[in-house]
Amino acid sequence: IFLSAFFTYVPMNEQIIIGRLGEDIILPSSFERGSEVVIHWKYQDSYNSYNVHSYYKGSGRLESQDTRYANRTSLFYNEIQNGNASLFFRRLSLLDEGIYTCYVGTAIQAITNKVVLKVGVFLTPMMKYEKRNTNSFLICNVLSVYPRPIITWKMDNTPISENNMQETGSLGPFSINSTLNITGSNSSYECTIENSLLKQTWTGRWTMKDGLHKMQSEHVSLSCELVNDYFSPNQDFKVTWSRMESGISSILAYYLSSSQNTTFYESRFSWNKELKNQSDFSMNLTDLSLSDSGEYLCNISSDEYTLLTIHTVHVEPSQETASDN
């Protein structure tokens, strides 16, 4: 038999595919069209090989499929005849990370494609401002991330290293808190969290504005602008105004860019519609009373950024009120 003269062997090709936890992915594999197609997708760890999906004699064969892949894999059966042996993989978990080999045999050749699957997760982080007794803290928090991210802090655009890191989740995904004590500081701070696998970066920026001194019954304008350096025009974001009182935050107003809806929780609170159209979310608080003294926090957040602006308002008694006493 002279078939071997027509037979070609193609060495193993390797591709890296990056997927997201809980999402679906396609592991690519193609071959030169031929008859008698046999496809075997296998997962290889340090000790063993596991059957992921097989196709031969014209149909999918799942008798020996490892249970962890049950109802999670399929081939593009209509495209096999066109040389497509790609595997559709549903609901990725971190345990799916690793090396997958796709063996394809036809009447004229056998090929083995190697796909390295890496799985990442990056739930949108948050920057929080907290007061504990007389201390002030900035917390950069990411609830679910994998692999371990790179977290950097800057003070007035200068990198700093002193921060307290807390991590949970021994194998991943990880939940990470990075806390910075900013008591008594008037500097601006920036925290960046980078997931190098997913090539995703999030930045939180905190700015303390100069204190505002106002008289009772007056109104105050609290500035908060969306900086174009941070936000692209079509990016969804939300704006939250809140007040910090005895370490507890209470929401005053809320704006969602996707729906353009604004909700006010304080009737004396408003913003200028013209300014809002120019991405300026400065607020007016009217008819000030002594109890309005405190810290006001503007939070503008998107998937990639959080901008926190703090205003300290001091409301002093008016002359009339003072002379009445």
């Epitope: 038999i1 071997s4 062997y9 008698e36 046999v38 004699k57 020996s64 063996y103 045999g105 036809t106």
Partner: antibody, heavy 121, light 106 residues
């Protein structure tokens, strides 16, 4: 071109063991399923066992199940058949044959020339 | 287990004849059937796979047909080199051979 060369045959007493080898060349051994097929003198062909390309699956004919073990060493391009508790009815020429593919198809595209095993007291 | 029955067991024919060998499966095997030719003292040689696909390098006078349980191997015009024993093999479930058909010179 594809070459399969069997060795290890000979005369053995009933109840004893024998190991057959098949040296493969001319193709990428680790890409193909391999079979053992036997033929008793003057009789027809009988399929004995198959091992898939990566050794993940092994199947046997009922007549040899529990007594014969098929294995392969892909680094040495060699197929093996360990035959234990041999019986007179195991006397045959043993062929090593290459599957068309991974072993999933189950027919024989290339054959060796065979090695004779005689079980006799 | 699937049984394969070949007929006839022996077939006498002359050079130039058209001959047909039949193979019957005890249950449906779809098209998963192969035909082999074996000469005395030699290893078998693959002729046909998937009931009707001609193996590369095999002369076109050999053809196969059938599906399910009934299959045939046809040699359209016998050549001197074709006198040998022919075996069918099902590979739907593991593997089973027919008992063989010896094609001899009349």
């Amino acid at each position: 071109q594809v070459q399969l060369v069997e060795s290890g045959g000979g005369v053995v007493q009933p109840g004893r063991s024998l190991r057959l080898s098949c040296a493969a060349s001319g193709f990428t051994f680790s890409d193909y399923g391999m079979h053992w097929v036997r033929q008793a003198p003057g009789k027809g062909l009988e399929w004995v066992a198959i091992i898939w390309y990566d050794g993940s699956n092994k199947y046997y004919a009922d007549s040899v199940k529990g007594r014969f073990t098929i294995s392969r060493d892909n680094s040495k391009n060699t197929l093996y058949l360990q035959m234990n508790s041999l019986r007179a009815e195991d006397t045959a020429v043993y062929y090593c044959a290459r599957d068309r593919s991974s072993g999933a198809l189950g027919y024989f595209q290339h054959w060796g020339q065979g090695t004779l095993v005689t079980v006799s007291s | 287990d699937i049984q394969m029955t070949q007929s006839p067991s022996t077939l006498s024919a002359s050079v130039g004849d058209r001959v047909t060998i039949t193979c019957r499966a005890s249950q449906s095997i779809s098209s998963w059937l192969a035909w082999y030719q074996q000469k005395p003292g030699k290893a078998p040689k693959l002729l046909i796979y998937k009931a009707s696909s001609l193996e590369s390098g095999v002369p076109s006078r050999f053809s196969g047909s059938g599906s399910g349980t009934e299959f045939t191997l046809t040699i359209s015009s016998l050549q001197p080199d074709d006198f040998a024993t022919y075996y069918c093999q099902q590979y739907n479930s593991y593997s089973t051979f027919g008992q063989g058909t010896k094609l001899e010179i009349k």
